[in-house]
Interface confidence: low
Amino acid sequence: GCALGGAETCEDCLLIGPQCAWCAQENFTRPSGVGERCDTPANLLAKGCQLNFIENPVSQVEILKNKPLSVGRQKNSSDIVQIAPQSLILKLRPGGAQTLQVHVRQTEDYPVDLYYLMDLSASMDDDLNTIKELGSRLSKEMSKLTSNFRLGFGSFVEKPVSPFVKTTPEEIANPCSSIPYFCLPTFGFKHILPLTNDAERFNEIVKNQKISANIDTPEGGFDAIMQAAVCKEKIGWRNDSLHLLVFVSDADSHFGMDSKLAGIVIPNDGLCHLDSKNEYSMSTVLEYPTIGQLIDKLVQNNVLLIFAVTQEQVHLYENYAKLIPGATVGLLQKDSGNILQLIISAYEELRSEVELEVLGDTEGLNLSFTAICNNGTFFQHQKKCSHMKVGDTASFNVTVNIPNCERRSRHIIIKPVGLGDALELLVSPECNCDCQKEVEVNSSKCHHGNGSFQCGVCACHPGHMGPRCECGEDMLSTDSCKEAPDHPSCSGRGDCYCGQCICHLSPYGNIYGPYCQCDNFSCVRHKGLLCGDNGDCDCGECVCRSGWTGEYCNCTTSTDSCVSEDGVLCSGRGDCVCGKCVCANPGASGPTCERCPTCGDPCNSKRSCIECHLSAAGQAREECVDKCKLAGATISEEEDFSKDGSVSCSLQGENECLITFLITTDNEGKSIIHSISEKDCPKPPNIP
């Protein structure tokens, strides 16, 4: 809890947890009780802290920009809004989470830029022939999906250095000379056709392409992907369009340090290096990009990669695609015969998914997502919706929290993969107390200026201690804090400041007394309740509340339940103890000792019943029932009965016989007569 966190300053208090607040009211606690200032707002109010002195900054969201999502076709593509809100500030209390909702809607008829990046190594000769009319066919198909489509073309082979190419003058000039066949010298990447809506121009360009060759199977395609992604102006990528990069190859690609074989050791810099002829000028200088570098640049430039690769390479490129946001893989026929359908399918797959990605300064920040997809279905810990139709809205609950109090704000971008739209999020920690702005330096409230007063407490200068800095280091003797010389200081339950005990806070209750020797929780318990819940614990003893008594306060002083029907306490046969009768008379029982078959003369009162029973025979015995009723008794012939608590009777009969019997009591207090017998009867006179 807040109060047990030991916070001595407002800022320390807020750091305990988002539920904690600080009371900056000047005389809120006794001087020693600094720790009591840190508690939940409700507890502080209950303790008497005025609302305007409670420091409790709350996490909050301030929306800076929230244009509505675009619906339907937009005249101007720069007006398209596909994510809402677009910009906000998130002020977070450390440890406290804040959830905001992000909505994404892929607008209808969104412009598409498609750059066709083709491997022109010798094995792709048949593919070049197949795609001679691709431009017009692709434009025709894409016009069904968007009214604003542009195509571009580039090609790649390999870094033109040994050992990737042969280096004899003849083979540098014609790497296919050994076939024999003429092909172009090996090149890294050529950007041939900037994005255009002129499909015939694309066809023309493709018809003019010639293949090239190299030695090893992997090609330099990743160099080409990097340049196609980052050379935004030269390629012609628009700001407000879907950027598709179709990578067509029948071979694996080199990446990262593969170029060390050729002595190239300068890491790829992720910058555009196209010369005046639009060729990659750093092919023989920079390493291939790593997968990580490619991911960064593709994401940064919203480029969605479509790997169109042959059967042997599909598995390999699927592994790459798993790492690259928004990348898809299509199976290319040997001669690229299915490239048109592959592109259309990949486009439709991309448009059926909305996935969020997070960029920026997220280290140490906890971000969790819940996707709310078609029909409002919730997907916990997911930031992707699939099987969406264009025009559907996907929503995402984004929960953010920061674990601790940093001094910096963070800039984060949440954006749909492949779309230019983004939510800009400024996350700033909310852990300053307003009261810290108002500092009284060398304050008179801190014992002759021995400290600064802020947030209701003193921050003491070096060499001074105590709630009001009243204690110098020379006054730190603890003798006066001990109840006896051999006892621990402040009974081990407090701190000795300036010869006075400041008792610790306890989760169980209050510790007090000049030596912290007392508390209000170390008393006896009755039924698990302190002082039977009928008294207060004061320094180890129960002080019973009115109406209760006893060591445990479990004994009521009320005698109401002891009064019998005739108004006499315990029927005059016992004492009322703790609200219950303790019967003193032998044979007396019942809640008010009202049952007592043995009280008075129990034997003689049964005489008429007994004598009737002895003198009557057969049917006449029925007459005795009434007599016995009057005597409050019944006669039992049973021999098996409990003799505990029974009364033994002897009566002198009319015929001088001695009658003996036993009386017991049933549960209702009625008498039952057992074992009736006559003995010592005088013999009748012997008259002959």
Epitope: Q60, I63, V71, I89, Q98, L100, Q101
Partner: antibody, heavy 128, light 113 residues
């Protein structure tokens, strides 16, 4: 409950800067979710939104006035202020301050009330 | 910018009779959270405006139930079921969707016949 009160000179000379202050009472200007706004109304005309400020200091201005407007906030005094530079007779109007509870996200939801608390307004005349 | 257009610009009503004021926005005020951010204000003579209705149809606290709002998307209506003398003044609609801008309609003046 929250009340707003505008204050400032009723007469300003052309080309000078108009300065108004709005004092918030009955509540804290630092309460989240509120945008503290200035609106004006030319004689016999409709309402024109000038701009607003969030307690953190973020400001938003009407594009048509943006080059001349500055809105600031002083949380310690529970006040926010308007400065309009290079005034002309066209700036003669009744100036209102208001509390605008605009769309603001929190707990996965948005809430919106509009301008729920207004000051009584102060008349400003621009004349030499 | 979103443009708010109100009709009619003035309205003369007999006490006890109903009245309707219309407001049209240049683009939909339906937000991505499913709420529509439009509100109505009344400015009585010599007073500041007061909030009547928010989010198209929600009456603000203290507003009599003879005032009701309806509409969706771009077209909205404020209805007064039985006009009373104290209802005279200028009524404004305002959009609240395109943060950070707040724009009002040009106002509808309501007077008693």
């Amino acid at each position: 409950q929250v009340q707003l009160q505008e204050s400032g000179p009723g007469l300003v000379k052309p080309s000078q800067t108009l300065s108004l202050t709005c004092t918030v009472s009955g509540g804290s200007i630092s309460s989240g979710g509120y945008y503290w706004s200035w609106i004006r109304q030319h004689p016999g005309k409709g309402l024109e939104w000038i701009g607003y400020i969030y307690y953190s200091g973020s400001t938003y201005y009407n594009p048509s006035l943006k080059s001349r407007v500055t809105i600031s906030v002083d949380t310690s005094k529970n006040q926010f202020s308007l400065k309009l530079s290079s005034v002309t007779a066209a700036d003669t109007a009744m100036y209102y301050c208001a509390r605008y509870r605009g769309p603001a996200a929190g707990r996965g939801d948005f809430y919106y009330f509009g301008m729920d608390v207004w000051g009584q307004g102060t008349t400003v005349t621009v004349s030499s | 910018d979103i443009v708010m257009t109100q009709t009619p610009l003035s309205l003369s009503v007999t006490p006890g009779q109903p009245a309707s004021i219309f407001c049209k926005s240049s683009q939909s005020l339906l937000n991505s959270d499913g709420k529509t951010y439009l509100c109505w204000y009344l400015q009585k003579p010599g007073q500041p405006p007061q909030l009547l209705i928010y989010e198209v149809s929600n009456r603000f606290s203290g507003v009599p139930d003879r005032f009701s709002g309806s509409g969706s998307g771009t077209d909205f209506t404020l209805k007064i079921s039985r006009v009373e003398a104290e209802d005279v003044g200028v009524y404004y609609c305002m959009q609240g969707i395109q943060l950070p801008w707040a724009f009002f309609g040009q106002g509808t003046k309501v007077e008693i016949k």
